[in-house]
Structure formats: structure tokens, C-alpha cells
């Protein structure tokens, strides 16, 4: 294997916490050059299972405004307006990565945690369980 | 906002980038404590708006493997399993953080980056455009 | 192509220690994490425990938990794992696997420990 | 801990034959669902990720299917190199293997 060189240009790792504790740079880079998508498409409206974007803030993580969607009905939307109860609206969620200040309060020490968000709703055919 | 006091048990700021290069612990913590929820539902398959996850790879990046989904038709799935191509499988997209070594093989100097994933499919109501 | 390659075969006694190493050739370990996965004569496989060396993040089986430790030197892309207070149940072929978190899809060639007294 | 159930534990073929391995988890686990080939005294190697994922480098006559808790691994054409001991594995929680399914020439 390749001995990982620990050049000049590397932060320094005396810290006796070194390697749990590491330098992150938050000058963060972003691959998507579109505007955010969850701003721009309409599908929590359009969607047979739709959704609600409630606003999830915490001023000690990163990012500190997450959106989670709980969708608005038990059942999916028919092509007349109504609800069939016969089908399923469901989170679709996701475990992201964030960053949570500990100690609380300090402004540039972190912890990474992963969390699960709903990010939208899908309609799903029901489980049926038949009794003997 | 709240203003964050600088208490004496934080890390010290005086880097001239400071807040834009902070100090992480890198001993995850999972807040999904149930058996792993986002690994235990088959909605992919049960949708209206039906996925298959392909396999995004990365050994540059943490995580290294993350799942994109695919919708699998235009249309979405009907009760007697044809695809109606009135309505539209889309993708739900979410923006994930990831880590990148930065530099390369520095064992302990990481940057932040942003990208959109493709977390599952919704069933929508197409936009029809009237012509004049 | 990555290729793990584990440290030799080891006879310990009862109650003692083995360390067994696992080094990454062709690529340093990346952002992957390294499983060990042990076997017992003529039985199937069993997860003990992984690591991300990029993190030093550690997770273990709850049946190893307090016994096994699991290490990582980045400067030579080397994995280890310790099972302390041997004994003869934990005579087995130890590997050690590049897990993607998802799947395992590299691995050692296998280390025999032979507990016996 | 999720328990994986393997059936049969053994089964005896012919080259050519079509091979089916069934593999039930104790609870749902989506499709984080791998097989595994091993061969004696080797380390076992990867042949199909989450359910049905041909593994790169993995003959096409392997194929896998499922979802949830019920899962199949085929063997479209059975091949001499093919007599082994086939393992599933769940990543839904921490893995754990399946007991082993032994495919013996007939």
C-alpha cells in the first residue's frame, strides 16, 4: 500500500484527540450549480401522495434549517380530488450527515451525526395481512 | 439569532478563517436508535411511482457509497399493474453533505461539500400547456 | 485492484491475547470502512466488528463488545483487530473486508487463530 | 440481531442445471440483501449487492430477486466452478450471514 505522506501542506495532528477530532473546512462546495431544487419543483403539491414542508430549526447544528415533509393524507389523491384509502402516502426518508456544536455554544467545534429526514411522500400499495 | 458565547472550554478561534474552518469530532453519532429505518422499507418496489437505487461510488468520499434512485417508468403503475402515461413518476431530490479529503491524503484535514441526490419517486399530475 | 493481505496463522492458550493485521496494497483504505468477519471450523460467517480509519469511528457486534478492539494506522494502511480472554470457541479464520456500509466486497485471504492449551 | 434463514442447507446438481437458493430474513430489510461464493479455504467473494445488483467481474448465469423478507439467489446454468457454500447477508442493521447453503455435484 502507499505510505500516506505527512506533508508540510497537512494540518497538524499533535491534538491528543487526533484522528477523532479533525479540521473541517465549511467553505463548502457545491456540486449542484442549479438553483435548490426543493425551491424550485412543485411536486409536494402535484403529487398523488402530497406533502407538507415543515421547517426544522436547530441553532446548533449545521445545516441549522432542515425542511421535513409529513404528508397531508392517509391515502393518495384519485384523479377527482379524493382520497382513496385503499393506497398509501409514505415518507420517503433519508439519513443525512450534519454537524452538531459540542461543547453546545462553541462556534467552531462540531460533531457528526447522522439523522434521518423524511424528504418527500410516495403512494404505496398496502401491506394486507390476511388472518388464517 | 441566539449570540454564542465564547466560553473558555471551546477550541480556540483565532484562525483568520475561523468560522469557515472548524474542528469536528469524527465519531458519529447516530440518532436513528430503532433498527436502521432507512434501510427497512420496500416502497421502492410498492409505489405508483416505482425506483430501482443504483450504486453511486466514491473511495474519495464519506460515505463512499450512496444510493440514487431511478424512477422506472414515465407514467406511474396502476391497480391492474399497467402504467398510465396521464401522470408522471418523478424524482425526489435532496441536498446531502459529504466529506472530501482535502488535501488529498491528509489524514486529518476534511472539507465540507454539498450534493443533490435522488432519494426515491413520487406519482404527479402532469403540467399541461394550453397553446393558444 | 485492492487486495487486503492479513498477517500468519497464530497458536495462543487460553485467556491470552492475538492481534491480527490487515494491510491495503494497490490504494490506501479511502473512505471505506474494514469489517472483521470471523469463521469457525465448519461454520458459517460471523460479524465481530469495523472501522473507518478515515474517522478511527469503530463499531462493534454486541456479542464482542468489551473483548475485541478494532485499530487503524493510516501511515501504512494498516487494519487490526485484538480478541482478548481466548478460548478454545474462538478457534476460527479471521477476515477482514472492505465493507462499503452496505456490502463487503474485498477481503483478506484469512488469519487461523488456534486457541489451545 | 436480524436472523437469515437459508434453504437447502445442502442440494446436489448436475452441470447445467438451473439452481435456486432461497434466503428469509426475520424481519423486513428491504433490499440491503448480498450473496456471497465461497470456495474451501478461500475468503468468500462477492457475487449480487442489495438484492439484485450483479457484482462487477460476476458471470451473468448469477442472478438474485426479492425483497423485504424473501430473497433468491439463481444459478441460470450451473458450471463446474460453480460447487461452493453460497452465503446471503443482510445490511440492513449490523450484518449477519445466513447459515450457508452447500451446492455438491450429484
Known amino acids: 500500500g502507499i505510505a500516506i505522506p505527512r506533508n508540510s501542506g497537512c494540518p497538524n495532528s499533535e491534538d491528543k484527540n487526533f484522528p477523532r477530532t479533525v479540521m473541517v473546512n465549511l467553505n463548502i462546495h457545491n456540486r449542484n450549480t442549479s438553483t435548490n431544487p426543493k425551491r424550485s419543483s412543485d411536486y409536494y403539491n402535484r403529487s398523488t401522495s402530497p406533502w407538507n414542508l415543515h421547517r426544522n430549526e436547530d441553532p446548533e447544528r449545521y445545516p441549522s434549517v432542515i425542511w421535513e415533509a409529513k404528508c397531508r393524507h392517509l391515502g393518495c389523491v384519485k384523479a377527482d380530488g379524493n382520497v382513496d384509502y385503499h393506497m398509501n402516502s409514505v415518507p420517503i426518508q433519508q439519513e443525512i450527515l450534519v454537524l452538531r456544536r459540542e461543547p453546545r455554544h462553541c462556534p467552531n467545534s462540531f460533531r457528526l451525526e447522522k439523522i434521518l429526514v423524511s424528504v418527500g411522500c410516495t403512494c404505496v400499495t398496502p401491506i394486507v395481512h390476511h388472518v388464517a | 439569532g441566539i449570540a454564542i458565547p465564547r466560553n473558555s472550554g471551546c477550541p480556540n478561534s483565532e484562525d483568520k478563517n475561523f468560522p469557515r474552518t472548524v474542528m469536528v469530532n469524527l465519531n458519529i453519532h447516530n440518532r436513528n436508535t430503532s433498527t436502521n429505518p432507512k434501510r427497512s422499507s420496500d416502497y421502492y418496489n410498492r409505489s405508483t411511482s416505482p425506483w430501482n437505487l443504483h450504486r453511486n461510488e466514491d473511495p474519495e468520499r464519506y460515505p463512499s457509497v450512496i444510493w440514487e434512485a431511478k424512477c422506472r417508468h414515465l407514467g406511474c403503475v396502476k391497480a391492474d399493474g399497467n402504467v398510465d402515461y396521464h401522470m408522471n413518476s418523478v424524482p425526489i431530490q435532496q441536498e446531502i453533505l459529504v466529506l472530501r479529503r482535502e488535501p488529498r491524503h491528509c489524514p486529518n484535514s476534511f472539507r465540507l461539500e454539498k450534493i443533490l441526490v435522488s432519494v426515491g419517486c413520487t406519482c404527479v399530475t402532469p403540467i399541461v400547456h394550453h397553446v393558444a | 485492484q485492492v487486495q487486503l493481505v492479513q498477517s500468519g496463522a497464530e497458536v495462543k492458550k487460553p485467556g491470552s491475547s492475538v492481534k491480527v493485521s490487515c494491510k491495503a496494497s494497490g490504494g490506501t483504505f479511502s473512505s471505506y470502512a474494514i469489517s472483521w468477519v470471523r469463521q469457525a471450523p465448519g461454520q458459517g460467517l460471523e460479524w465481530m466488528g469495523s472501522?473507518?480509519?478515515?474517522?478511527?469511528?469503530?463499531n462493534y457486534a454486541q456479542k464482542f463488545q468489551g473483548r475485541v478492539t478494532i485499530t487503524a494506522d493510516e501511515s501504512t494502511s494498516t487494519a487490526y483487530m485484538e480478541l482478548s480472554s481466548l478460548r478454545s470457541e474462538d478457534t476460527a479464520v479471521y477476515y477482514c473486508?472492505?465493507?462499503?456500509?452496505?456490502?463487503?466486497?474485498?477481503w483478506g485471504q484469512g488469519t487461523l487463530v488456534t486457541v489451545s492449551s | 440481531d436480524i436472523q437469515m434463514t437459508q434453504s437447502p442447507s445442502s442440494l446436489s446438481a448436475s452441470v447445467g442445471d438451473r439452481v435456486t437458493i432461497t434466503c428469509r430474513a426475520s424481519q423486513g430489510i428491504s433490499n440491503w440483501l448480498n450473496w456471497y461464493q465461497q470456495k474451501p479455504g478461500k475468503a468468500p467473494k462477492l457475487l449480487i449487492y442489495?438484492?439484485?445488483s450483479l457484482q462487477s467481474g460476476v458471470p451473468s448465469r448469477f442472478s438474485g430477486s426479492g425483497s423485504g423478507t424473501d430473497f433468491t439467489l439463481t444459478i441460470s446454468s450451473l458450471q463446474p466452478e460453480d460447487f461452493a457454500v453460497y452465503y446471503c447477508q443482510q445490511y440492513s442493521d449490523d450484518p449477519t450471514f445466513g447459515q450457508g447453503t452447500k451446492v455438491e455435484i450429484k
Open positions: 442489495a438484492a439484485s
Open positions: 473486508a472492505r465493507d462499503s456500509e452496505y456490502y463487503f466486497d474485498h
Open positions: 472501522i473507518i480509519p478515515w474517522f478511527g469511528y469503530t
